[in-house]
């Protein structure tokens, strides 16, 4: 029995729970998901029982090995998986636990602009990047392009200070999770600040 194995999968994709055993006479292998039986295998008896019929088409054993492949992943497949190898040659079953995290492929992140001010020819605002559907474990970074050196900023909020007359800048939000990444539409500093250009002391949402 080894340490817990952490696995990551994407919605619609597949994941393989790796399992090896040198036991000669395996009587049965039992896979469970959050304490619910998933699959029972009897290598010598010749049978594989998939507890829930809807999972039958999703279960596979690559190259006829002990590892279990689960395909057509759904969000609610996330959880704890446990396997026990039972054999009369073992005093107690050989076990392994896995934690599966299933993530969605990220859609295009949405950018909103905070309160904007324009003082002394400098446009100051915040850009906030977020996912519309509240996806989990998303990491945001911002790329600022256009100055001599391109800059990166970590976090969903990007504070902007852009002076009229400077070369235009482009801001792009990058959203990442363990299985995918996506980019916001590029935002140009000049366009962003145009609304506040007429009134040097204006604020707008």
């Amino acid at each position: 029995s080894g340490p817990v194995k952490e696995l990551v999968g994407s919605v619609g994709g597949a994941v393989t729970f790796p399992l090896k055993s040198k036991v000669k006479q395996v009587d049965s292998i039992v896979w469970t998901f959050n304490t619910t039986p998933l699959v029972t295998i009897q290598p010598e008896g010749g049978t594989i029982i998939v507890t829930q019929n809807r999972n039958r088409e999703r279960v596979d054993f690559p190259d006829g090995g002990y590892s279990l492949k689960l395909s057509k992943l759904k969000k609610n497949d996330s959880g704890i998986y446990y396997v026990g190898i039972y054999s009369s040659s073992l005093q107690q079953p050989s076990t392994q636990e896995y934690v599966l995290h299933v993530y969605e492929h990220l859609s295009k992140p949405k950018v909103t602009m905070g309160l904007q001010s324009n003082k002394n020819g400098t446009c100051v605002t915040n850009l906030t990047c977020c996912m519309e559907h509240g996806e989990e474990d998303v990491i945001y970074t911002w790329k600022a392009l256009g100055q001599a050196a391109n800059e990166s900023h970590n976090g969903s909020i990007l504070p902007i200070s852009w002076r009229w007359g400077e070369s235009d800048m482009t801001f792009i939000c990058v959203a990442r999770n363990p299985v995918s990444r996506n980019f916001s539409s590029p935002i140009l500093a000049r366009k962003l600040c145009e609304g506040a250009a007429d009134d040097p002391d204006s604020s707008m949402v």
């Epitope: 010598e44 008896g45 010749g46 006829g64 090995g65």
Partner: antibody
């Protein structure tokens, strides 16, 4: 990748014995059952028996008791089958085939076959 | 020993057709049935094990089903390269494992 390479064809006289080999590569030879299967010309398949190279344990089809002896050598990663007291009904192609781990009775990799002809 | 019977020794079909090969066990073998394909001059190739589990790399036009004593092997849309002999085999519990007599699939 998994490969099973069998020895070449044999022409033997009635009453003689023959030993055919199956050299394995690309997988954990000691931990997988190796099967032997007979196929007479134009006929179906007949399971002879299997051996576990890790400890030499064998399971055989009673029909081949006294006819086929299965052995294995871990160091050379080879399985062997000796056929004794040969008669014309032993003329056949003999295959070695590896058992899958998940289903020990299902055979996923097969050798190319060894043709044994018994003729005086 | 358990006897596996494939009632059709030959089956003739056309490319694109659906073909069903049947196999009957002389006693209950649960779902412990494998299907093999053997092309002329070649070794058998495992397609299905435990009645319905497709082996890695086997095209999904090949499917297996059944339990107890009655089993079927289906090719949903026959291709020219499927010309072969198909064998069922029971791998239930204690050996000996036994094979059906084979069904030769011929392309019209």
């Amino acid at each position: 990748q998994v490969q099973l390479q069998q020895s070449g064809p044999e022409l033997v006289k009635p009453g003689a014995s023959v030993k055919i080999s199956c050299k394995a590569s690309g997988y954990a030879f000691s931990n997988s059952w190796m099967n032997w299967v007979k196929q007479r010309p134009g006929q179906g398949l007949e399971w002879i028996g299997r051996i576990y190279p890790g400890d030499g344990d064998t399971k055989s089809n009673g029909k081949f008791k006294g006819k086929a002896t299965l052995t294995a050598d871990k160091s050379s990663r080879a399985a062997y089958m000796q056929l004794s007291s040969l008669t014309s009904v032993d003329s056949a192609v003999y295959f070695c085939a590896r058992s899958t781990m998940i289903m020990t009775g299902a055979m996923d990799y097969w050798g190319q076959g060894t043709s044994v002809t018994v003729s005086s | 020993d358990i006897v596996m019977t494939q009632s059709h020794k030959f089956m003739s079909t056309s490319v694109g057709d659906r073909v069903i090969i049947t196999c009957k066990a002389s006693q209950d073998v649960s779902t412990a049935v494998a299907w093999y394909q053997q092309k002329p001059g070649q070794s058998p190739k495992l397609l299905i094990y435990s009645a319905s589990f497709r082996y890695t790399g086997v095209p999904d036009r090949f499917t297996g089903s059944g339990s107890g004593t009655d089993f079927t092997f289906t090719v949903s849309s026959v291709q020219a390269e499927d010309l072969a002999v198909y064998y069922c085999q029971q791998h239930y519990s204690t050996p000996p494992y036994t094979f059906g007599g084979g069904t030769k699939l011929e392309i019209k």
